[in-house]
């Protein structure tokens, strides 16, 4: 058993049929010594008396808010949550496995630049009685500070018969050094509580590996005289790190016909313009990637040819 | 070239070679970012590689003030990785095929380090740890970890030379 926050405790249980459970001793936070009784949740049934209560925690029915009273007055509360371990593996019932980039990916994180700011998100099908708390640091043995905001519901989607809820959180490294080569990864820890179930999820990454630039901006076409060719030009996204002579991007320009089956013409360039042939009903798209480190490509920015 | 008097390197040449290094480092093992490298007996592996840290003057402002600190750090790293790529970790079993990009990568690391430090001028170099894995699978794991950290190192070096070529070239 360990304290999650004031008056909230997590009991770690090996979860299998007829498991013995854990013996837990609760102590009433009061100077009083006599006439103390204990109840669980809304029930008025007295579970025991005295300053301490010893209980055997085996299942969710044994978890909940234990309250000690004296003469009708509430003295203190202790909320017990359960953390299940099945076959040596902690349960992951609350969040959905996003399976990208690999199985058992519950948290996904992205950064738009090297400023030390990043966003993480996760998915669940649970709609109520759900709370999240997020902590982060750079490194684990001698951790350096990363400040995270509160997790918020950022999207709702319908997936077949199920509703899926996306939560996200923004974090910022306290003393970020954008030009340095990271040697210690960022660690992100999410505590999830659904009713009386506690779970924790972690992710470890370098900012460089989660970079995904915003799409190029101000994508424009300029027809070239007496030619089917056009000059495509664009700019670095506003959110990308500066100066651009240091934090450089590379670009992929694609000409795509109306039909998905049509052959795509692709050009790669480090410049912010390119000359391509504009076919009728086609569209031109440009995306960006860090020039020197193969992290994710941005989403496409597109304009029609006509 | 970075010579004892602290004059400028051939920024444009360094830019071209460092960008080539980036390409080679990724082609040497493109999947490296998606490998699950957590294995038993794997803790001590590449914690000793030189990193370009915050105080090394490799940021745009530091380069403007005095690029020598940063160039020395990059040079140390290039020599370090060049030695690792020439060691038993990469020459031992399982063997790399003759057309593996690791050979080109090794040569390019040497080429860039020589551009930064011509004959007769010696910067201090960092001690190369004696990593001599006894098992072929450990050698394989070390390769991936070394390539992964090399990818990060050469990315910073390439940014430095790109910025230098754009803003510090005479």
């Amino acid at each position: 058993i360990w304290e999650l926050k004031k008056d909230v405790y997590v009991v770690e249980l090996d979860w299998y049929p007829d498991a013995p459970g854990e013996m837990v001793v609760l102590t009433c936070d009061t100077p009083e010594e006599d006439g103390i009784t204990w109840t669980l949740d809304q029930s008025s049934e007295v579970l025991g008396s005295g300053k301490t209560l010893t209980i055997q925690v085996k299942e969710f029915g044994d978890a909940g808010q234990y309250t000690c009273h004296k003469g009708g007055e509430v003295l203190s509360h202790s909320l017990l949550l359960l953390h299940k371990k099945e076959d040596g593996i902690w349960s992951t019932d609350i969040l959905k496995d996003q399976k990208e980039p690999k199985n058992k990916t519950f948290l996904r994180c992205e950064a738009k630049n090297y400023s030390g700011r990043f966003t993480c998100w996760w998915l669940t099908t649970i709609s109520t009685d759900l709370t999240f708390s997020v902590k982060s640091s750079r490194g684990s043995s001698d951790p350096q500070g990363v400040t995270c905001g509160a997790a918020t519901l950022s999207a709702e989607r319908v997936r077949g018969d199920n509703k899926e809820y996306e939560y996200s959180v923004e974090c910022q490294e306290d003393s970020a050094c954008p030009a340095a080569e990271e040697s210690l990864p960022i660690e992100v820890m999410v505590d999830a509580v659904h009713k009386l179930k506690y779970e924790n999820y972690t992710s470890s990454f370098f900012i460089r590996d989660i970079i995904k630039p915003d799409p190029p901006k101000n994508l424009q076409l300029k027809p070239l005289k007496n030619s089917r060719q056009v000059e495509v030009s664009w700019e670095y996204p506003d959110t990308w790190s500066t100066p651009h002579s240091y934090f450089s991007l590379t670009f992929c320009v694609q000409v795509q016909g109306k039909s998905k089956r049509e052959k795509k013409d692709r050009v790669f360039t480090d410049k912010t313009s390119a000359t391509v042939i504009c076919r009728k009903n086609a569209s031109i798209s440009v995306r960006a990637q860090d020039r020197y480190y193969s992290s994710s490509w941005s989403e496409w920015a597109s304009v029609p040819c006509s | 070239r970075a010579v004892p008097g602290g004059s400028s390197p051939a920024w444009t040449q360094c830019q071209q070679l460092s960008q080539k290094l980036c390409t080679l480092a990724w082609s040497a093992h493109p999947l490296v970012g998606h490998m699950d490298l957590r294995e038993e007996g794997d803790e001590e592996t590449t914690n000793d590689v030189p990193h370009i840290q915050c105080g090394d003057g490799c940021d745009p402002q530091g380069l403007r003030d005095n690029s020598q600190f940063c160039l020395q750090r990059i040079h140390q790293g290039l020599i370090f990785y060049e030695k690792l790529l020439g060691s038993d970790i990469f020459t031992g079993e399982p063997s790399l095929l003759p057309d593996s990009p690791v050979g080109q990568l090794h040569a390019s690391l040497l080429g860039l380090s020589q551009l930064l430090q011509p004959e007769g001028h010696h910067w201090e170099t960092q001690q190369i740890p004696s990593l001599s894995p006894s098992q072929p699978w450990q050698r394989l794991l070390l390769r991936f970890k070394i390539l992964r950290s090399l990818q990060a190192f050469v990315a910073v070096a390439a940014r430095v030379f790109a910025h230098g070529a754009a803003t510090l070239s005479p």
Partner: antibody, heavy 126, light 111 residues
Framework: QVQLVQSGAEVKKPGSSVKVSCKAS????????ITWVRQAPGQGLEWMGE????????YYNEKFKGRVTITADKSTSTAYMELSSLRSEDTAVYYC???????????????????WGQGTLVTVSS | DIVMTQSPDSLAVSLGERATINCKAS???????????LHWYQQKPGQPPKLIYN??KPESGVPDRFSGSGSGTDFTLTISSLQAEDVAVYYC?????????FGGGTKVEIK
């Protein structure tokens, strides 16, 4: 075509040594390793060790505690396995096999004993 | 040393029936999660062994009735429809750690 031709059968006294040769042809000798495997009569296979002429690396089965020495002569494309302090339980067929042990992006850990010698019967008897 | 335990020691199967050979390692013989350092060899009487499965991949020329599966410590070689020419002793071999070790062998015969 690839061939590994081993030296002929040997009868040895306990305490003596035996040196089995394995002449390789039909491929570039230094591009592959040579592995030695033995098989006692009616028994299973036992890996003794292997040598890679290109890297110069030799790996041994510690079970033989310094009794086995594996070498290669690049000039004649011949591998050798010497076993000393022979005892009756060393009676076995000794095989050499070509070892391909490579790493590529597609196959990061490819190991194959793809061609084998015909085997050399070593009998240890007083 | 990694100990490789094969089961069963011998197996008699009717022609056209399925034969399943198991190999259990005393330690994990996969590398970084998925790459297998476990191989299967076939040895017919009076002949040297022949590689049939390399990691998770069949060697070229090996009939597709042979299939290898497994990861971590438990591996299986399956012959989906036994043919007369499949009568042999089958060995698993791990080359994750030196010394490389073979399983004790499984003799496959026709019932």
């Amino acid at each position: 075509q690839v061939q590994l031709v081993q030296s002929g059968a040997e009868v040895k006294k306990p305490g003596s040594s035996v040196k089995v040769s394995c002449k390789a042809s039909g491929y570039t000798f230094t591009s592959y390793g040579i592995t030695w495997v033995r098989q006692a009569p009616g028994q299973g296979l036992e890996w003794m060790g292997e040598n890679y002429p290109r890297s110069g690396n030799t790996y041994y089965n510690e079970k033989f505690k310094g009794r086995v020495t594996i070498t290669a002569d690049k000039s004649t494309s011949t591998a050798y396995m010497e076993l000393s302090s022979l005892r009756s339980e060393d009676t076995a067929v000794y095989y050499c096999a070509r070892a391909e042990f490579i790493s590529t992006v597609v196959a990061p850990y490819y190991y194959a004993l793809d061609y084998w010698g015909q085997g050399t019967l070593v009998t240890v008897s007083s | 040393d990694i100990v490789m335990t094969q089961s069963p020691d011998s197996l008699a199967v009717s022609l056209g029936e399925r034969a399943t050979i198991n190999c259990k390692a005393s330690k994990k013989v996969t590398i970084y999660g998925s790459t297998s350092a476990l191989h299967w060899y076939q040895q017919k009487p009076g002949q040297p062994p022949k590689l049939i499965y390399n990691g998770a991949k069949p060697e070229s020329g090996v009939p597709d009735r042979f299939s290898g599966s497994g990861s971590g410590t438990d591996f299986t070689l399956t012959i989906s429809s036994l043919q007369a020419e499949d009568v042999a002793v089958y060995y698993c071999l791990q080359n994750k750690e030196v010394p490389y070790t073979f399983g004790g062998g499984t003799k496959v015969e026709i019932k």
